[in-house]
Interface confidence: low
């Protein structure tokens, strides 16, 4: 806390500019009007203030807006955002995607901080659902964002948003999350033709039920082993040897290398040896 002192003669700030970088903390407190700061927030980031000076500027904004900053100020916080606590951010009402992007840009290149997590939470809750533009933005900054959500939170993702999801966005999702996302993806991509559909749905197949895998096996999709290994074990077990052969196409030979790993191991144990022998891979049930 900077103690209240009168502003020295001739030092009252008429605008937020470079001259302020040499003001001591108490001078900033005494000579910079909070309302002026709020209207010229966009200039702060172009001025080389020290961390200590930024603390004073934040304190002034906190006094001006004890109930939380208006979006007009939030949008121009820039690196002052890094000074905010999650408690500060919980007071905000952020509705503009441009504001969200501006603040995510500040944190770019860093891990998701508690501040960013709180900001995203406030934004998504304010919108009521995770729409495509928001998801597009969030996954661009944080590829792992989608998989950081609970299945309950993912249930608010509309199928139309699934178009924004890239394969790498699902890398860290667990089966429970894919169980929620897969039906949405199936709905989103339902009007695509066979080969295009498979390219889009492939990343989501960890949530696919047996009947969908059976249907895919009839479409010459040539699923790679990496995708096959991510399928739900309970969905793979009922598949016949013939169906797995059709599903994998030329990749079926890869089963040998994975015979000790789930779901391949469990699937092999469910098959008749005669059927396995038709693959000519030496798999032992």
């Amino acid at each position: 806390e900077v103690e209240k002192t009168a502003c020295p003669s001739g030092k009252k700030a008429r605008e937020i500019d470079e001259s302020l970088i040499f003001y001591k903390k108490w001078e900033l407190e005494a000579c910079v009007d909070a309302a002026l700061l709020a209207t010229q927030m966009d200039r702060v980031n172009a001025i080389p203030f020290t961390y200590e000076q930024l603390d004073v500027l934040k304190h002034k904004l906190d006094e001006l807006y004890p109930q939380g900053y208006p979006e007009s100020v939030i949008q121009h916080l820039g690196y002052l955002f890094l000074k905010m606590s999650p408690e500060d951010i919980r007071k905000w009402n952020v509705t503009s995607l441009e504001t969200l992007k501006a603040l995510l840009e500040v944190n770019k290149g860093h891990e998701m901080s508690p501040q960013v997590a709180t900001l995203i939470d406030r934004f998504v809750k304010g919108r009521g659902q995770l729409d495509k533009d928001t998801l597009d933005t969030l996954t661009a900054f944080y590829p792992g964002y989608l998989c950081s959500l609970s299945p309950e939170e993912l249930s608010s993702v509309p199928p139309s948003s699934i178009w924004a999801v890239r394969p790498q966005d699902l890398d860290t999702c667990d089966p429970r999350q894919l169980d929620v996302l897969y039906p949405k993806a199936r709905l989103a991509f339902q009007n695509m033709n066979g080969s295009e559909y498979f390219v889009k749905i492939q990343s989501f197949l960890g949530g696919a039920p047996t009947e969908d895998l059976k249907a895919l096996s009839q479409q010459n999709v040539s699923m790679d082993l990496a995708t096959f290994m991510k399928l739900r074990t309970d969905a793979v077990l009922p598949l016949t040897v013939a169906e797995v052969q059709k599903l994998l196409g030329p990749h079926v030979e890869g089963l040998k290398a994975e015979e000790r790993h789930r779901p391949v191991r469990d699937w092999i144990l469910r098959q008749r040896q005669d059927d396995l022998d038709t693959l000519g891979l030496g798999l032992q049930g």
Epitope: I21, N45, A46, I47, P48, F49, T50, Y51, G78, Y79, E105, V106, K108, G109, H110
Partner: nanobody, 129 residues
Framework: QVKLVESGGGSVQAGGSLRLSCAAS????????MGWFRQAPGKEREGVAK????????YYADSVKGRFTISQDRRNNTLYLQMNSLAPEDTGMYYC??????????????????????WGQGTQVTVSS
């Protein structure tokens, strides 16, 4: 890692001159501010002079204007502070600092932002009357 090493401090009579140097290393991204700060015993640290090495713009505290000159040798990554007409109130520890970052893609958004996150160990300047 960004490293800043100051030198050139010392004791001098009032009215004398000193030239401080700051050797910087560890950058992959060249734009940002470098500056000189000082701290007298028991006082708050204050900015003395800063330079934006994108366009060479310089900024000075009122108390040193016309007496101190900040400059840089970009080829050798060295910052200087030429101090003339020194007075006893200029006594203190002088620190070199920068907001240039070691990670080239982090600071591209607002390269002029002044987070002076990297500091040297300081060099002592003593001016006696």
């Amino acid at each position: 890692q960004v490293k800043l090493v100051e030198s050139g401090g010392g004791s001098v009579q009032a009215g004398g001159s000193l030239r401080l140097s700051c050797a910087a290393s560890g950058y992959t991204y060249s734009y940002g501010y470098m500056g000189w700060f000082r701290q007298a015993p028991g006082k708050e640290r204050e900015g003395v002079a800063k330079i934006y090495n994108g366009d060479g713009s310089t900024y000075y505290a009122d108390s040193v204007k016309g007496r101190f000159t900040i400059s840089q040798d970009r080829r050798n990554n060295t910052l200087y502070l030429q101090m003339n007409s020194l007075a006893p109130e200029d006594t203190g520890m002088y620190y070199c600092a920068t907001n240039r970052l070691p990670n080239s893609d982090v600071d591209l958004v607002l390269p002029r932002f002044g987070r002076f996150g990297y500091w040297g160990q300081g060099t002592q300047v003593t001016v006696s009357s």
